[in-house]
Amino acid sequence: GPVWRKHYITYRINNYTPDMNREDVDYAIRKAFQVWSNVTPLKFSKINTGMADILVVFARGAHGDFHAFDGKGGILAHAFGPGSGIGGDAHFDEDEFWTTHSGGTNLFLTAVHEIGHSLGLGHSSDPKAVMFPTYKYVDINTFRLSADDIRGIQSLYGDPKENQRLPNPDNSEPALCDPNLSFDAVTTVGNKIFFFKDRFFWLKVSERPKTSVNLISSLWPTLPSGIEAAYEIEARNQVFLFKDDKYWLISNLRPEPNYPKSIHSFGFPNFVKKIDAAVFNPRFYRTYFFVDNQYWRYDERRQMMDPGYPKLITKNFQGIGPKIDAVFYSKNKYYYFFQGSNQFEYDFLLQRITKTLKSNSWFGC
């Protein structure tokens, strides 16, 4: 059956049961994911907006799939195997009484079972397994996966050691707070900012100081290291990633099939062999592509280059250039341009630099 073809998996709690405090729901779901991340290379991250891989839903009766709930008792929950759209989603019957303890139906225990399905596990015939088809309360403080559960999930994803990086002195993880740190590409992805460098990316969740480093291959195994440019069209849940003369399309954090494609399909002349940086401006519905000391402007609606390009970067972005490493769009009025270890906040309405920063200023360095 199917599995997630990446190790970084997002989840979102769509709505909350009134039976429990929101914090208790968050905690139960987080701990349930942790049960599986403890024994695999998988990493789970909760997002609050946008498309998550796994959507957690509390619903009663008919709720948009073929499997209407049946009132109190009977079916407690169900979850879909890995995949796009509804794939991975976990639905909990709101007609049950959800609890943190042995009364009613324990959300944590039920969630561990359902997340097992979300990750690709079927039912187990071992009555001691959490994947056994019938619900039975066990003390959640001493709860452990059975050997059968662990065998099953590790047959799909391997054990946690497979997530640990082998030392690679030629391509080791860059020091995040090195004052000379530069980035290959930067883009927003929903409420996050992705910073690419060599074979790594850092994930910065807006307004939070905490960041995490990941291997590009752990999120997108089919993508190369050394991403050179990236941009997001948030309204379409699309991210475009560029390396050399090729680009990849990521939809809802999943690579689309039939990629990479040639950058020349955008309309670049043949002499353009790579893109240095790219940024999409949703106000104008245009993407700006930066190549050496020039830039092109692409109409995403008409799917063609605007006439009159390329233009010089220095001529139209006062104080920026002649070349840039990376750029992203934020807060509805700023481009953040990266040149080596420096970063420039550029107000595209005023058409001038409003702040000069270090490239790693986003990380509280």
């Epitope: 199917p2 959507l55 619903a59 709720h63 799939d65």
Partner: antibody, heavy 122, light 103 residues
């Protein structure tokens, strides 16, 4: 390349029976939910029936419940629809459609056959 | 049972126009809504799944939005090949269809 090819349609009298087949290729048939969807002449789409990957779980629209039976033979990569007690209102093009993998059906029909016409008339 | 109401039932537009079709569910279906295109004599084709995800191979002028009960299919700039009938769907329920015709 995913392909679905329906067969078995034709003209049948009211009260008669017909068995439709859908031959699948280009994917691991035994992993996927499969469905029948029909379309009466000049009308919209109507879901008819669905079956789980193993064949152990079946679902029917109220309009065909008790008259139609969906089944599958995973060794032959084939989906079936046995239609009994046919009525004039069952006249339609019948499409087979592929759904997702897994224990539950999403009703996400990503590949469709070309359809086979069933005409119920005296 | 959940009902799906699609509007309008027919629509005339010209090449290059921006077109919007809406679909309303009688109760929340979260983001579990799909859109299909069907041309005369052909099988339906999946365009958008999970309300806003573009099916592979579908041109990016098609987009979907919405969650809960209200959903929209938008074609940003109509092309000649887009004149067809469009259906929304969740589980076993299809909308009545919207026939998009050339003005």
């Amino acid at each position: 390349e995913v392909q679905l090819l329906e067969s078995g349609g034709g003209l049948v009298q009211p009260g008669g029976s017909l068995r439709l087949s859908c031959a699948a290729s280009g994917f691991t048939f035994s992993w996927y939910w499969m469905h029948w969807v029909r379309q009466a002449p000049g009308k919209g789409l109507e879901w008819v029936s669905g079956i789980s990957p193993s064949g152990g779980y079946t679902m029917y629209a109220d309009s065909v419940k008790g008259r139609f039976t969906i089944s599958r033979d995973n060794s032959k990569n084939t989906l079936y629809l046995q239609m009994n007690s046919l009525r004039a209102e069952d006249t339609a093009v019948y499409y087979c459609a592929r759904d997702i993998v897994g224990p539950y059906s999403a009703g996400l029909f990503d590949y469709w056959g070309r359809g086979t016409l069933v005409t119920v008339s005296s | 049972d959940i009902q799906m109401t699609q509007s309008p039932s027919s629509l005339s537009a010209s090449v290059g126009d921006r077109v919007t079709i809406t679909c309303r569910a009688s109760q929340s279906i979260y983001t579990y809504l799909n859109w299909y295109q069907q041309k005369p004599g052909k099988a339906p084709k999946l365009l958008i799944y999970a309300a806003s995800s573009l099916q592979s191979g579908v041109p990016s002028r098609f987009s979907g939005s919405g969650s809960g009960t209200d959903f929209t299919l938008t074609i940003s700039s109509l092309q000649p090949e887009d004149f067809a009938t469009y259906y929304c769907q969740q589980a076993g329920i299809f909308g009545q269809g919207t026939k998009l015709e050339i003005k």
